[in-house]
Interface confidence: medium
Amino acid sequence: HLNLTARQQDPEDTPQTDEGDDRVWCHVCERENTFECENPRRCQWTEPYCVIAAVKIFPRFFIISKQCSASCAAIEIPKPEEKRFLLEEPLPFFYLKCCKTRYCNLQGPAINTSSFKEYAG
């Protein structure tokens, strides 16, 4: 959530508001046909993950959602920091990123939107 927005901890800069509170900071927003949205929020204790999910509505049209999440099927051991993958039919989700570091769900896949729309087709 939007506590005059989010912060990361610098070694030389640790006010009490940064101490003893390891809740993750994520972006929480939704957009059509683009991954470009940002809305920094601190997640609840019960939501330790950031996610981006892209959902195909119909060919060449998708909606992305950036959220805090209580769980993450995409996290694997022994590399818990992040996993991205594309999902095939018949699942409507065709891109998912799940991660645990501050603002880690800001960016989507490393391909441009038009290429991504082609994939969504």
Partner: antibody
Framework: QVQLVQSGAEVKKPGASVKVSCKAS????????MHWVRQAPGTGLDWMGW????????NYAQKFQGRVTMTRDTSISTVYMELSRLRSDDTALYYC???????WGQGTLVTVSS | DIQMTQSPTSLSTSVGDRVTITCQAS??????LNWYQLKPGKAPKLLIY???NLERGVTSRFSGSGSGTDFTFTISSLQPEDIATYYC?????????FGQGTRLEIK
Amino acid sequence: QVQLVQSGAEVKKPGASVKVSCKASGYTFTGYYMHWVRQAPGTGLDWMGWISPNSGGTNYAQKFQGRVTMTRDTSISTVYMELSRLRSDDTALYYCAREVGNYWGQGTLVTVSS
Amino acid sequence: DIQMTQSPTSLSTSVGDRVTITCQASQDIYNYLNWYQLKPGKAPKLLIYDASNLERGVTSRFSGSGSGTDFTFTISSLQPEDIATYYCQQYDSLPITFGQGTRLEIK
């Protein structure tokens, strides 16, 4: 230590624009969102919007939409707030505030008067 | 927009008094609430964050409680230096909004 230093007081005529700067030091500038808040005489605090010094992304309060522009210059760790089409009721103290609200600039008084 | 209704708007009080200010949100904001102190010519000072956490360096005379829509800010024993205007602020959703403020005066 963290410091936010704002530009000096401004006197403007109605219809003009004003650009207030906020120079940050003592922390990683691109790691923290910056907000602008104003306080008009005899009124409360009014949130204007935020800017991401990292991406340059912005989010403005509806009441300032179309009149406010927030920008940043990462090379000098400075954010700017420009307010256009000034009216007399824009006379206020303008503050930059880092993220959580535990660090604020000293405020910049903008007076709009004909 | 989330409306923050703060009361009272002003309070005449005496040194040593217990002071209570309330803030009501127009919808559930969890615990996403700050309390600020504002003195003339000075920048706002964060006192309480996340509704009940005392910011470092802030006197323990100040405390906050509440969650959801109803919040309370308390000064256990008012001191002369506490004379100021106090604001609540929600940061659950944009736009960030403030209460209208509570001005403390000495009787």
